[in-house]
């Protein structure tokens, strides 16, 4: 059956009879109506991916390199199935490229120039491609040939395989810059060698090579990595401070129509019957005929790529940056030291209006990009199509978990002057009823459920990591009869209550009228029995603050909090009767863009902040109505962070541990990409 | 209610300029943000360039150097001078104002510019 085959691309003759031999061995152990191989022969990676694209093949494993070429227009491949390496209860998917140094020496990531490098080999990833591909626009000019800007940039280096007739500066540290193990200073531990006979200064390896060649931790302890916001941290902390992570080797299929399951479905199959040790007669990973054919001889079996993660993403900004340097050989115009507009993520068509305005009225130093959710944003951010956005704590979790960093924090209660430098402790998460009915915290189940948004923080994260401690499952839609929680599956219970419209039904972005802490509140007017929403959220919508036609005669008296001891307490009385607190909404950023996007914003505060008092004829950073775009429109300023830098920090312990065992009821699929 | 008018375009050739207007009523004109915006076949609302209420301007990237934003606060009206148009200029064009504070759906008809030989 055609659309059960999966048609694998070979790159050889070799290739090409493992391939055979694959699709024999599978057709043995497979029913007859599962997934079949079939193979098709090309003379090359990139024909392989332009076969694919072309729909001529649908599979083939690339290096990480090649997935760049496999990503790019007109090929638009995705990765759908990664090899993973050591043990399956610790599958090890990418390396990390790093910067190694002695401890006793004191520059950074921007102080290279004039110092001693040493490198795994010319065109490598770790030792040359990712190094240099990022400090590619620190490169004196002309940067072409490459390998002479290089030798111009470092004072001497060891670069095996470069042309050291041509360019004896690469090979100043290595002699004849020798092509295999007969250079000491060949490949990843011949570069680490470089460094530790003290005859570079620094060496681009991968982040195992320390750990491989010096097995005493002491030892190890002689050494930092170089951070690429110019700190320094130790070896073991290669996670946080590395200069790409680098994904291993990657089954590539079609963006649409690419069979991802079918091909998950094959392989899993495949490593089950024909994976390491399994099997004496056809192994997947070795053969006979070669070395890594189809697939790595190193690899312990497959892992699939979740399918939120394309290829950016799995790529990852840092390794796409350097590998489009180097490619396309352009930098900006301006220095790099030089904060170029930050691009805001707006959601959806009225924060884009809003962010609009704000982009005229900054005079351009702020531009604005559009997506529909806010797990979209993230994702541009992440990319580098987007900088900034201000996200509620359950998203600043998310975000954290994808390599974000929070730059300044949302405060609501501290008066100008001292607001910029104040860290608020938060707001109260509340669980909102009508004064007329009779309901408690311990009566919910059955009732209708208003919440801002799946994975927000008082819509969302409080109330239902207390549900779920209760009833230990996460059918929260069985819970509640019905209800309105933005983001949930579009045939929920959970959706039920939402009003669209239409196509925007049940969507987590201002387009879904019962959206956000506005609209979750206007839910409970509206349709529902409980409403759970920051604690300011009655105030600021009723009494005629809110002119809106469902709201303008709203009374505070007619909503009360629900209190965990099943009492209820006046809204007035959040401090007494709340279900938690909850971090104050934070603006996130990639780290290497976190210091201008706070220069700028400290700066767009001052003139468009809550010193603005007429918000009718001039721009208002902090006002929206009640709709809450870009900001909460109760944002008095934006401050710093000082030492709560990361997300762990900010949002503290007992948030992070809630969100973290709410985790096993996620939904958010970015969140399983990022953590993959 | 607020009201916005936009006229003046039509079928020029490449290189060739147009002028567009946007007669606005019930808005307090004097004191908002104006923005001109466009939409092109199949393509999402695009912001082409802005004027803030002390006639700071913006344009985006594409158009800086051939288009002028203005205002004429004593008529109400916002204008658009496009010169050395080229066929991606293509569009319906749309003024707004973001006087509300709501980021409404106050949008004129349009006027649709065509740019082809």
């Known amino acids: 059956v055609p659309e059960k085959s999966v048609r694998w691309c070979a790159v050889s003759e070799h290739e090409a009879t493992k391939c055979q031999s694959f699709r024999d061995h599978m057709k043995s152990v497979l029913p007859s109506n599962g997934p079949s191989v079939a193979c098709v022969k090309k003379a090359s990676h990139l024909d392989c991916i332009r076969a694919i694209a072309a729909n001529e093949a649908d599979a083939v494993t690339l290096d990480a390199g090649l997935v760049y070429d496999a990503y790019l227009a007109p090929n638009n491949l995705k990765p759908v199935v990664a090899e993973f390496y050591g043990s399956k209860e610790d599958p090890q998917t990418f390396y990390y490229a790093v910067a190694v140094v002695k401890k006793d020496s004191d520059f950074q990531m921007n102080q290279l120039r004039g110092r001693k490098s040493c490198h795994t080999g010319l065109g490598r990833s770790a030792g040359w491609n990712i190094p240099i591909g990022l400090l590619y626009c620190d490169l004196p000019e002309p940067r072409k040939p490459l390998e002479k800007a290089v030798a111009n940039f470092f004072s001497g280096s060891c670069v095996p395989c470069a042309d050291g007739t041509d360019f004896p500066q690469l090979c100043q540290l290595c002699p004849g810059c020798g092509c295999s193990t007969l250079n000491q200073y060949f490949s990843y531990s011949g570069a680490f060698k470089c460094l530790k006979d003290g005859a570079g200064d620094v060496a681009f390896v991968k982040h195992s090579t320390i750990f491989e060649n010096l097995a005493n931790k002491a030892d190890r302890d002689q050494y930092e990595l170089l951070c690429l916001d110019n700190t320094r941290k130790s070896v073991d902390e290669y996670k946080d401070c590395h200069l790409a992570r680098v994904p291993s080797h990657t089954v590539v299929a079609r963006s649409v129509g690419g069979k991802e399951d079918l091909i998950w479905e094959l392989l899993n199959q495949a490593q089950e019957h024909f994976g390491k040790d399994k099997s004496k007669e056809f192994q997947l990973f070795s053969s006979p005929h070669g070395k890594d054919l189809l697939f790595k001889d190193s690899a312990h079996g497959f892992l699939k790529v979740p399918p939120r993660m394309d290829a950016k993403m799995y790529l990852g900004y840092e390794y796409i940056t350097a590998i489009r340097n180097l490619r396309e050989g352009t930098c900006p115009e301006a220095p790099t030291d030089e904060c170029k507009p930050v691009k805001w993520c707006a959601l959806s068509h009225h924060e884009r209006l809003k962010c609009d305005e704000w982009s005229v009225n900054s005079a351009g130093k702020i531009e604005c990009e559009s997506a529909e959710t806010t797990e979209d944003c993230i994702a541009k951010i992440m990319n580098g199509e987007a900088d900034a956005m201000s996200l509620d704590g359950g998203f600043v979790y998310i975000a954290g978990m994808c390599g974000l960093v929070p730059v300044l924090a949302e405060n609501y209660n501290t008066p100008n002057p001292n607001c910029e430098n104040t860290a608020e402790e938060g707001y109260f998460a509340v669980a909102v009823v009508k004064s007329s009915s009779d309901l408690t915290w311990d009566n919910l189940k059955g009732k209708k459920s208003c919440h801002t948004a799946v994975g927000r923080t008082a819509g969302w994260n409080i109330p239902m990591g207390l549900l779920y401690s209760k009833i230990n499952h996460c059918r929260f839609d069985e819970f509640f009869s019905e209800g309105c929680a933005p983001g949930s599956e579009k045939n929920s219970s959970l959706c039920k209550l939402c009003m669209g419209p239409s196509p925007n039904l049940c969507e987590p972005n201002n387009k879904e009228g019962y959206y956000g802490y506005t609209g979750a509140f206007r839910c409970l007017v509206e349709k529902g029995d409980v409403a759970f929403v920051k604690h300011q959220t009655v105030p600021q919508n009723t009494g005629g603050k809110n002119p809106d036609a469902w709201a303008k005669n709203l009374k505070e008296e007619d909503y009360e909090l629900l209190c965990l001891d099943g009492s209820r307490k006046s809204v007035q009385e959040p401090a007494n009767c709340h279900l938690a607190r909850a971090p104050n909404h934070a603006v996130v950023a990639r780290k290497d863009k976190a210091d201008c996007v706070q220069t700028l914003l400290l700066d767009q505060q001052r003139m468009f902040g809550s010193s603005v008092t007429d918000c009718s004829s001039n721009f208002c950073l902090f006002e929206s109505k009640t709709k809450d775009l870009l900001f909460r429109d109760d944002t008095v300023c934006l401050a710093k962070l000082h030492d709560r830098n990361t997300y762990e920090k900010y949002l503290g312990e007992e948030y992070v541990k809630a969100v973290t065992n709410l985790r096993k009821c996620s939904t958010s699929p970015l969140l399983e990409a990022c953590t993959f | 209610e607020v009201q916005l008018v936009e006229s003046g375009g039509g079928l020029v050739q490449p290189g060739g300029s147009l002028r567009l207007s946007c007669a606005a009523s019930?808005?307090?004109?004097?004191?908002?943000?104006m923005a001109w915006y466009r939409q092109a076949p199949g393509k999402g609302l695009e912001l082409v360039s802005g004027?803030?209420?002390?006639?700071?301007?913006n344009y985006r990237d594409s158009v800086k150097g051939r288009f002028t934003i203005s205002r004429d606060n004593s008529k109400n009206t916002l204008y658009l001078q496009m010169n050395s148009l080229r066929a991606e200029d293509t569009a319906v064009y749309y003024c707004?104002?973001?006087?509300?504070?709501?980021?409404?759906?106050?949008w004129g008809q349009g006027t649709l510019v065509t740019v082809s030989s």
């Open positions: 019930g808005s307090i004109f004097s004191i908002a943000t």
């Open positions: 004027i803030t209420r002390s006639g700071s301007t």
């Open positions: 707004t104002d973001y006087s509300s504070r709501y980021y409404h759906d106050y």
